[in-house]
C-alpha cells in the first residue's frame, strides 16, 4: 500500500481467483484513543472499533472511503483504491489502446516546435467518476522540471455504439533550449482513477521524435501564362521554431481530387513555393516536416484549384 | 557563444553540401545498423544516449543562432577554446565566434572519425562479419573536415591488445551512430543558418 495523495491510498493486488489479498492497517488521524468506530462509504454498519482497523483487501467491495468517528463526529477519512495486477501485468482497463505507432500505446504526445512545450492525449469510453493527474520530468534518475496543466476533456466522438472521450494535457519543460541535443527523454506519468480502480500509464520520448509542425499558412496560387501550371506559395506556420534558417522545414505539395484513388501531381521542395499542374475540381495541398530530422508530417493545408 | 548574422560572402557556403551528405550518410548507416542488428538493442528507445564530445567540445553553444542567445536556457555553456583558422566561409569577415563554432564542429568530426575507425578495425575481426562501417560515411566525414580546413593535432587511433567483445562493440556502434546522427542534425542546421546569413 502507498499514499497517492493526502488520505488516498493505493492497494496493489495480485488479481486471480481466490487470491489472499492484502492485509491493510488503517490508523485514525486523531489524538483520541477511546470510543472510535469505523464505517465504509455511506454504510452505517460498524466495521470495528479502536484507533486502528485491520482489513483484508481482496476485491473492489473492500475498497472505498473508510471513516473513523467518535460520538457521531467524523475524525478522519482514508480512501482505498485498488491497483490490479493480472499475470504480473498491471491492468489497463481505463484507457483505450490507440495502437499507434505500436500496440500498447495509451498516451500519445506531440510538439509543434522545439520550445519544450508538448501536448499528450488519451482515449477512454468511460464518461463518469473519472479523474486524471499528470506529472512529467526530463529523465528519471535526476529529474529536471516539466510543468503540466490539468487534464481536460478535449473531444467526444461516437464510435459505433460507443462514445469515446479524448482527454488532453499541455506540458512545458521548465528550462528548454530549442537548439539543445536531448540525451535524456521526457517522462510522462498519468494517474487514472475510475471509481475505486487506480491505474497508471507512462510514456517516454524525446521532443525531437514527437515533433509535428502545424500546417503551412497563407497558401496562394498564381497561374502561369500559357500553361496548365500554377505557382503555389506558402509560409512557415507561426508556431514553428525560429530562426527558420536554423530550424528549416521541407514540404510536400500535392494536387488531388476528392478521392484518394484519383490521379495526382506531387512534388517535394525545401522552398516555400512550387509549380504544379492544377486540374478542375482538384485541390492543392501542402504539408511540412522538419528538414533534418524526419519526425511526423504536419496536417495538410489546402486550397481549391479553381 | 553565438553566431553573428552578417558575414558569408555571396555564393554557396562550401560546407552546406558536405553537411547534407554527412547527415544522409549517417542516417543511412544507422538504418542499416538497425536492420542488420535487429536482435541487438539498437533503437533509440533501447540504447543509452551518450555523447563522446561531452566536456570536450561545445558545438551547440558555440554555434547558437543569434536569435537564441536571448534564451537563458541556451546559455549555460562551458567555455572551450579552439583554433580559429577555418576556411569554410571563404571570407575574411569570418568572425571569431563563427570560427569557434566551425572549429568545434571540426573537433567533433575528428573525435567521431577516430572512434569509427577504431570500431571498424574491431568489426573486421568479427568471424560473423555481420556489419561494417559504410566507407561512404567515413569519406563524407573526411570531406567535411577538409572543407572546414582546421589544423589540429592528429588523434592517434586507439589500438586495443585484448580480444574484442563483438557484442559490446556492436552495441557501442549503435550508441555512437545515434549520437552522431543527432550531432549531424545540429551541424546541418548550423550550416543552413550560416548559408542564409
Amino acid at each position: 500500500i502507498w499514499e497517492l495523495k493526502k488520505d488516498v491510498y493505493v492497494v496493489e493486488l495480485d488479481w486471480y481467483p481466490d487470491a489472499p489479498g492484502e492485509m491493510v492497517v488503517l490508523t485514525c488521524d486523531t489524538p483520541e484513543e477511546d470510543g472510535i468506530t469505523w464505517t465504509l462509504d455511506q454504510s452505517s454498519e460498524v466495521l470495528g472499533s479502536g484507533k486502528t482497523l485491520t482489513i483484508q483487501v481482496k476485491e473492489f467491495g473492500d475498497a472505498g472511503q473508510y471513516t473513523c468517528h467518535k460520538g457521531g463526529e467524523v475524525l478522519s477519512h482514508s480512501l482505498l483504491l485498488l491497483h490490479k495486477k493480472e499475470d504480473g501485468i498491471w491492468s489497463t482497463d481505463i484507457l483505450k489502446d490507440q495502437k499507434e505507432p505500436k500496440n500498447k500505446t495509451f498516451l500519445r504526445c506531440e510538439a509543434k516546435n522545439y520550445s519544450g512545450r508538448f501536448t499528450c492525449w488519451w482515449l477512454t469510453t468511460i464518461s463518469t467518476d473519472l479523474t486524471f493527474s499528470v506529472k512529467s520530468s526530463r529523465g528519471s534518475s535526476d529529474p529536471q522540471g516539466v510543468t503540466c496543466g490539468a487534464a481536460t476533456l478535449s473531444a467526444e466522438r461516437v464510435r459505433g455504439d460507443n462514445k469515446e472521450y479524448e482527454y488532453s494535457v499541455e506540458c512545458q519543460e521548465d528550462s528548454a533550449c530549442p537548439a539543445a541535443e536531448e540525451s535524456l527523454p521526457i517522462e510522462v506519468m498519468v494517474d487514472a482513477v475510475h471509481k475505486l480502480k487506480y491505474e497508471n500509464y507512462t510514456s517516454s520520448f524525446f521532443i525531437r521524435d514527437i515533433i509535428k509542425p502545424d500546417p503551412p499558412k497563407n497558401l496562394q496560387l498564381k497561374p502561369l501564362k500559357n500553361s496548365r501550371q500554377v505557382e503555389v506559395s506558402w509560409e512557415y506556420p507561426d508556431t514553428w521554431s525560429t530562426p527558420h534558417s536554423y530550424f528549416s522545414l521541407t514540404f510536400c505539395v500535392q494536387v488531388q481530387g476528392k478521392s484518394k484513388r484519383e490521379k495526382k501531381d506531387r512534388v517535394f521542395t525545401d522552398k516555400t513555393s512550387a509549380t504544379v499542374i492544377c486540374r478542375k475540381n482538384a485541390s492543392i495541398s501542402v504539408r511540412a516536416q522538419d528538414r533534418y530530422y524526419s519526425s511526423s508530417w504536419s496536417e495538410w493545408a489546402s486550397v481549391p484549384c479553381s | 557563444r553565438n553566431l553573428p548574422v552578417a558575414t558569408p560572402d555571396p555564393g554557396m557556403f562550401p560546407c552546406l553540401h558536405h553537411s547534407q551528405n554527412l547527415l544522409r550518410a549517417v542516417s543511412n548507416m544507422l538504418q542499416k545498423a538497425r536492420q542488420t542488428l535487429e536482435f541487438y538493442p539498437c533503437t533509440s528507445e533501447e540504447i543509452d544516449h551518450e555523447d563522446i564530445t561531452k566536456d570536450k567540445t561545445s558545438t551547440v553553444e558555440a554555434c547558437l543562432p543569434l536569435e537564441l542567445t536571448k534564451n537563458e536556457s541556451c546559455l549555460n555553456s562551458r567555455e572551450t577554446s579552439f583554433i580559429t583558422n577555418g576556411s569554410c566561409l571563404a571570407s575574411r569577415k569570418t568572425s571569431f565566434m563563427m570560427a569557434l563554432c566551425l572549429s568545434s564542429i571540426y573537433e567533433d568530426l575528428k573525435m567521431y572519425q577516430v572512434e569509427f575507425k577504431t570500431m571498424n578495425a574491431k568489426l573486421l575481426m568479427d568471424p560473423k562479419r555481420q556489419i561494417f562501417l559504410d566507407q561512404n560515411m567515413l569519406a563524407v566525414i573526411d570531406e567535411l573536415m577538409q572543407a572546414l580546413n582546421f589544423n589540429s593535432e592528429t588523434v592517434p587511433q586507439k589500438s586495443s591488445l585484448e580480444e574484442p567483445d563483438f557484442y559490446k562493440t556492436k552495441i557501442k556502434l549503435c550508441i555512437l551512430l545515434h549520437a552522431f546522427r543527432i550531432r549531424a542534425v545540429t551541424i546541418d542546421r548550423v550550416m543552413s543558418y550560416l548559408n542564409a546569413s
Epitope: R261, K263, K264, D265, R266, F268 | -
Partner: antibody
C-alpha cells in the same frame, strides 16, 4: 494485369509525320496520366509530353513544342503520339508510359521503333 | 532544364557483390528522383520512387538514398537477372529529364 501495347515499327521519310498508338488494358484508362518518352539508338531517355485522357489536357517538352501532338481516345483506351516534320535524328524507340502520379512512370509500353530515312 | 548526370556509365560487377550507381542533379531537386531498370526487349521497370521509396514486387536488395543533388541506387547483392541498364529521372520540374543510364555488366 496493367499493360500498354504499342503499334508496330515504322519507316518514314524526312519531312513526313508519324503517329504511334498505345492501347491500355487493365484499370480505367482515364484514371492515369499517359506520357511519351523516346530513346535514340545508343542514347538515353528523353521525355516528350503527357496527356490527361479525362479532359485532354496536355503538356509538351519545349524541345518538341509545335511538332508533337498527343491525343487520347477514351472509347478505345488508346493514346496517340504524332510527330511531324521528321528528321533523321528522330530515329528512336518511342515509349508510352503511364501512372496515377503525374511525374514518374510505373508501367511502360514495349516501345515502337521509328526509323527516319530517305 | 535540369541536367541529370549518372556515374559510372558502365559498371562491371561480380554476381553476389554489391553495386552502387550515382546520380547527380544540376540543381537541388529535394527527393524528386526515381530509378528505372531497362533490359533489352523488355518494358522499363520502376524500381524506386521519390529517392528511397520501395515498390512492392521489387526485390528488397534494391534501395535508394539521397536528396538535394546527390542520389544513389544500391543493389546489395547482384543477382544474374540484375544485369541491365539503370536510369534516374527527376520530377522536380518540367521538362522531366533522365540520366544517361548506367550499364551494369558481368565482371
Amino acid at each position: 494485369q496493367v499493360q500498354l501495347v504499342q503499334s508496330g515499327a515504322e519507316v518514314k521519310k524526312p519531312g513526313s509525320s508519324v503517329k504511334v498508338s498505345c492501347k491500355a488494358s487493365g484499370g480505367t484508362f482515364s484514371d492515369y496520366y499517359l506520357h511519351w518518352v523516346r530513346q535514340a539508338p545508343g542514347q538515353g531517355l528523353e521525355w516528350m509530353g503527357w496527356i490527361d485522357p479525362e479532359n485532354g489536357d496536355t503538356e509538351y517538352a519545349p524541345k518538341f513544342q509545335g511538332r508533337v501532338t498527343i491525343t487520347a481516345d477514351e472509347s478505345t483506351s488508346t493514346a496517340y503520339m504524332e510527330l511531324s516534320s521528321l528528321r533523321s535524328e528522330d530515329t528512336a524507340v518511342y515509349y508510352c508510359a503511364r501512372n496515377k502520379e503525374l511525374r514518374y512512370f510505373d508501367v511502360w509500353g514495349q516501345g515502337t521503333l521509328v526509323t527516319v530515312s530517305s | 532544364d535540369i541536367v541529370m548526370t549518372q556515374s559510372p556509365l558502365s559498371l562491371p560487377v561480380t554476381p553476389g557483390e554489391p553495386a552502387s550507381i550515382s546520380c547527380r542533379a544540376s540543381q537541388s531537386i529535394s527527393i524528386n528522383l526515381h530509378w528505372y531498370q531497362q533490359k533489352p526487349g523488355q518494358a522499363q521497370r520502376l524500381l524506386i520512387y521519390f529517392a528511397s521509396q520501395s515498390i512492392s514486387g521489387v526485390p528488397s536488395r534494391f534501395s535508394g538514398s539521397g536528396s538535394g543533388t546527390d542520389f544513389t541506387l544500391t543493389i546489395s547483392s547482384l543477382q544474374p537477372e540484375d544485369f541491365a541498364t539503370y536510369y534516374c529521372q527527376q520530377s522536380n520540374s518540367f521538362p522531366l529529364t533522365f540520366g544517361q543510364g548506367t550499364k551494369v555488366e558481368i565482371k
